[in-house]
Amino acid sequence: AGYVFRDKVMSEFNNNFRQQMENYPKNNHTASILDRMQADFKCCGAANYTDWEKIPSMSKNRVPDSCCINVTVGCGINFNEKAIHKEGCVEKIGGWLRKNV
C-alpha cells in the first residue's frame, strides 16, 4: 500500500509541476515556487531542462534563471547546457520525498 501511495504522490507531483510550468512566468506566485524548487534542488524542468522548450510563454532558447548553476539575472537566456542544471525536478525532488516523507 505504501508503494502505491508513493507512486500516486509522485504522479500527482509530476502533473502539478508541469501545470505550474505552463503558468510560468505569468503567475508571479507560481514562478517564485518553481524558481525556489529549481534553485534549491539544482534541477530544471519536470523530466529535464528540455521541458521548458514546450512552454509557449518561454522563448525556445531560454530556461528560467533558476536553472543556472550560477544564478544571475538573464543567465537562462540563450543558455549553454554546461551552464545549467540538466536533471529534471520530478526525479530529483521525488528522490528527496522518498527518503524524507
Partner: antibody, heavy 119, light 108 residues
Framework: QVQLVESGGGLVKPGGSLRLSCAAS????????MNWIRQAPGKGLEWVSY????????YQADSVKGRFTISRDNAKNSLYLQMNSLRADDTAVYYC????????????WGQGTLVTVSS | DIQMTQSPSSLSASVGDRVTITCRAS??????LNWYQQKPGKAPRLLIY???SLQSGVPSRFSGGGSGTDFTLTISSLQPEDFATYYC??????????FGQGTRLEIK
C-alpha cells in the same frame, strides 16, 4: 588554436542530397553549441541550423525544415549537415560556426564549403 | 521572429573618417547584439558582442553601443583594412537566429 574545417560541398542536381562535415579542433567541443550558417552568392548571412552541446536540442530555419538535419559526434569532434531534396536556392557557402551562447556571439567560423545546386 | 534592420545598406568613406552604422531590432533584445566584419571571399569575424564588448584581438577603434532596439557600430578612424561588409545579429530570442542585411563600407 581553434580550427573548424568544413568538407563535403560540391555540385549537385536539384532534388539531390549532400552531407557536409565539420572537423573541430583546438577546443573542448562539448562546451559549445554548433551552427551551420550559409551565404548565397552576393547575399547576406542566413542561419540554417543549430545543435546543443549534447545534441538534445536541434533547430532548423523554416527554409530548410524537413529537408536538412543537423547532427554531431562528440567522440569525433565533428558536426554534420545532411541536406536532402536540394533546390537551386540552397546554393551557398556553408559555414560551420562555434557558439558559446549567452550574449557572446559566434566567435569562430570555418572557411566555408561551397554547395552548388544546378542541373 | 525578430527582424534586424541595418542602415545604411552601403556607405562611402575615406581613410581617417569616423563612421557609424546602425542596427534596429523589431522588438527589445536587451544587449544580445553582435557585430561581424566580412571581407570578400572570407568568413565573417566577430568584432563586438553583447552590444558593446570588444572581442579579443579587435582594434580599439571599433566600438559598439545601444540596448533594447537601437544599436550602433562606430569606427573612430577608418583604416584601409576596414573596408568590408558589416552585419549585426541578435541572439536574444531564437530560433531563428537573425542577421541584419549588411552594410557595405566602400572607399570614397
Amino acid at each position: 588554436q581553434v580550427q573548424l574545417v568544413e568538407s563535403g560541398g560540391g555540385l549537385v542536381k536539384p532534388g539531390g542530397s549532400l552531407r557536409l562535415s565539420c572537423a573541430a579542433s583546438g577546443f573542448t567541443f562539448t562546451d559549445y553549441f554548433m551552427n551551420w550558417i550559409r551565404q548565397a552568392p552576393g547575399k547576406g548571412l542566413e542561419w540554417v541550423s543549430y545543435i546543443s552541446n549534447s545534441g538534445a536540442i536541434k533547430y532548423q530555419a523554416d527554409s530548410v525544415k524537413g529537408r536538412f538535419t543537423i547532427s554531431r559526434d562528440n567522440a569525433k569532434n565533428s558536426l554534420y549537415l545532411q541536406m536532402n531534396s536540394l533546390r537551386a536556392d540552397d546554393t551557398a557557402v556553408y559555414y560551420c560556426v562555434r557558439d558559446p551562447r549567452s550574449y557572446y556571439g559566434f566567435d569562430y567560423w570555418g572557411q566555408g564549403t561551397l554547395v552548388t545546386v544546378s542541373s | 521572429d525578430i527582424q534586424m534592420t541595418q542602415s545604411p545598406s552601403s556607405l562611402s568613406a575615406s581613410v581617417g573618417d569616423r563612421v557609424t552604422i546602425t542596427c534596429r531590432a523589431s522588438q527589445s533584445i536587451r544587449n544580445f547584439l553582435n557585430w561581424y566584419q566580412q571581407k570578400p571571399g572570407k568568413a565573417p569575424r566577430l568584432l563586438i558582442y553583447a552590444a558593446s564588448s570588444l572581442q579579443s584581438g579587435v582594434p580599439s577603434r571599433f566600438s559598439g553601443g545601444g540596448s533594447g532596439t537601437d544599436f550602433t557600430l562606430t569606427i573612430s578612424s577608418l583604416q584601409p583594412e576596414d573596408f568590408a561588409t558589416y552585419y549585426c545579429q541578435q541572439s536574444y530570442s531564437n530560433p531563428p537566429i537573425t542577421f541584419g542585411q549588411g552594410t557595405r563600407l566602400e572607399i570614397k
